[in-house]
């Protein structure tokens, strides 16, 4: 787990989960509601997504020398893309289809923030912006830029995670 | 439209193994996650595990670990679940149905008997 | 695991009766809630998904409301045809547990 004093977190358990991750991700891109959408718009309604940077130390290097700052990257983006998934965007109408995965996408990425962050211990989170769509096609919109941003997300997570829990494992 | 075609009832001796089919048409088979569910005699539901086409990767109820091995065959649109080392307790109704939230699919269901 | 607390296990109404059954989650899941029909012999069929939301072709005399841990479904205007065991399932994050059912029984 990421604690105060740099302990190191249950790589191979992250691994795990951020995979599962990945999947959930792509498998509920599609069923994320009923309008068939040709036209996706511009980009900025999702420019403010959190997305891991070369200066988030998640490279090899960074993370031999100090996890802590790509795990609080990798953090913030975990609740940033939980609270969406739990906001009027997802919530609201249209309905999400009955097949759709989303709950274990937002159950499986407060886990993985749980394991990052033990309770007592809190690192800075980014605000949300106000995304709040009146339209139910503008949600829809959202709901899919969202998916398409978390997945992008969890893949570069997951690529962290398998680094770590090959090299940087106890 | 959407249809899961189930195998057959089984009636198998205890201490083997069991191979159970779910066959999907109507719609992209890859797209869903394909869901079993059990029910005993007379009993409640309980979820055994779920599977991803595309990926193959399978998730298990801790309770069935061991007990069910999930598959899928992509190019016959077909899932299934192995039951192994089979007892009186592994006797019911085994359902596959479509998606990794609520179902609003389901197979008949196939009757597996336990039975020396 | 999540358990699902659902209550009551039997209950006896008659045709045009009004009936609630509840299901109480052992944690927060949201809306992440479906509820199922069951009669003797057939498939579960999809009442009600997220917590409120009506499944395809499902008569509008049924109703789920409910977030967080609580949770009911209600049958307005008993049909005979509605007659059977009721199960609640939540959806937010695996192992999905079921609840133990409601048998609704006529009158």
């Known amino acids: 787990r990421a604690v105060p004093g740099g302990s190191s977190p249950a790589w191979t358990q992250c691994q795990q989960l951020s995979q599962k991750l990945c999947t959930l991700a792509w498998s509920a891109h599609p069923l994320v509601g009923h309008m068939d959408l040709r036209e996706e718009g511009d980009e900025e309604t999702t420019n403010d997504v959190p997305h891991i940077q070369c200066g988030d130390g998640c490279d090899p290097q960074g993370l031999r020398d100090n996890s802590q700052f790509c795990l609080q990257r990798i953090h913030q983006g975990l609740i940033f893309y939980e609270k969406l998934l739990g906001s009027d965007i997802f919530t609201g109408e249209p309905s999400l289809l009955p097949d759709s995965p989303v709950g274990q996408l937002h159950a499986s990425l407060l886990g993985l923030s749980q394991l990052l962050q033990p309770e007592g211990h809190h690192w800075e989170t980014q605000q949300i912006p106000s995304l709040s769509p009146s339209q139910p096609w503008q949600r829809l919109l959202l709901r899919f830029k969202i998916l398409r941003s978390l997945q992008a997300f969890v893949a570069v997570a997951a690529r962290v995670f398998a680094h770590g829990a090959a090299t940087l494992s106890p | 439209h959407v249809q899961l075609q189930q195998s057959g009832p089984e009636v198998v001796r205890p201490g083997a193994s069991v191979k159970l089919s779910c066959k999907a048409s109507?719609?992209?088979?890859?797209?869903?996650?394909m869901t079993w569910v059990k029910q005993r005699p007379g009993q409640g539901l309980e979820w055994i595990g779920q599977?991803?086409?595309?990926?193959?990767?399978?998730d298990y109820n801790e309770i069935f670990e061991g007990k069910a091995t999930l598959t899928v065959d992509t190019s016959s649109s077909t899932a299934y679940i192995q039951l192994s080392s089979l007892t009186s307790e592994d006797s019911a109704v085994y359902y596959c149905?479509?998606?990794?939230?609520?179902?609003?699919?389901w197979g008949q269901g196939t009757l597996v008997t336990v039975s020396a | 695991d999540i358990q699902m607390t659902q209550s009551p296990a039997s209950l006896s109404a008659s045709v045009g009766e009004t009936v609630t059954i509840t299901c109480r989650a052992s944690?927060?899941?949201?809306?992440?809630l479906a509820w199922y029909q069951e009669k003797w012999g057939k498939s579960p069929q999809l009442l009600v998904y997220n917590a409120k939301t009506l499944a395809e072709g499902v008569p509008s005399r049924f109703s789920g409301s409910g977030s967080g841990t609580q949770f009911s479904l209600k049958i307005n205007s008993l049909q005979s045809e509605d007659f059977g065991s009721y199960y609640c399932?939540?959806?937010?994050?695996?192992?999905?547990?079921f609840g133990s059912g409601t048998k609704l029984e006529i009158k």
């Open positions: 149905a479509r998606g990794g939230g609520g179902f609003a699919y």
């Open positions: 599977i991803f086409p595309v990926r193959g990767s399978a």
């Open positions: 944690e927060n899941i949201y809306s992440y």
């Open positions: 399932q939540h959806h937010y994050g695996t192992p999905f547990t």
């Open positions: 109507g719609y992209i088979f890859s797209a869903y996650w």
